[in-house]
């Protein structure tokens, strides 16, 4: 950080490495929860028109797909991978692609993915071939 840019104590809006380098924040789709028509497809686009700068540079992009008897929703947000989201750890946060993994939630079908490339939660991937054989 240049000397004219103040350092701040205990502020997680500025992530630095051991050399004091500053991390650029992630750009993610961020529409919170929206109704979705994404169903029985290998991949879907979020149809979220808002790309937001994540508040904290350590945050990654997250997408949550939920289906119950009444509707399907898709949630797109930024989130810190050190913290659980919907009670689940973001285990794939370093992935460049948002590859959906099913999670156990009573009364609904629940898939979640996280990723760390710009707007990566715009394209959510359900296809098994990505989960197993795709190195990306």
């Amino acid at each position: 950080i240049p000397p004219h840019v103040q350092k701040s104590v205990n502020n997680d809006m500025m992530v630095t490495d051991n050399n004091g380098a500053v991390k650029f924040p992630q750009l993610c789709k961020f529409c919170d929860v929206r109704f979705s028509t994404c169903d029985n497809q290998k991949s879907c686009l979020s149809n979220c028109s808002i790309t937001s700068i994540c508040e904290k540079p350590q945050e990654v992009c997250v997408a949550v797909w939920r289906k119950n008897d009444e509707n399907i929703t898709l949630e797109t947000v930024c989130h810190d991978p050190k913290l659980p989201y919907h009670d689940f750890i973001l285990e794939d946060a370093a992935s460049p692609k948002c590859i959906m993994k099913e999670k156990k939630k009573p009364g609904e079908t629940f898939f979640m993915c996280s990723c760390s490339s710009d707007e990566c939660n715009d394209n959510i991937i359900f296809s098994e071939e990505y989960n197993t054989s795709n190195p990306d």
Partner: nanobody, 124 residues
Framework: EVQLLESGGGLVQPGGSLRLSCAAS???????RMWWVRQAPGKGLEWVS?????????YYARSVFGRFTISRDNSKNTLYLQMNSLRAEDTAVYYC?????????????????WGQGTLVTVSS
Amino acid sequence: EVQLLESGGGLVQPGGSLRLSCAASGFTFTEYRMWWVRQAPGKGLEWVSAIEPIGNRTYYARSVFGRFTISRDNSKNTLYLQMNSLRAEDTAVYYCAKQMPGQKWMAKSRFDYWGQGTLVTVSS
């Protein structure tokens, strides 16, 4: 020598407007995503807005969405931030910064990434 020179800051009343400029030189402006970053007294950096080098896709922090507008004039190597409906919490030093495609980190103490900043004070 790379230079980023911000201007346009000042004292403004809540609800007022300001337009910040950042004059860039010493590098190929059209190769960089450009950012506005701010730092309130005693606080960390807040990434306010960004704009792509070509095509002018823009991005905003949720705290400024709908109030601030980022733009660039590649023919003048200049970045702008139009700030409307200003609030006390927008008080900060505003810096422009540059980002190469794919770049994740900015090196420490590198003046070629940062300007000197311009102070915006929102107060009645």
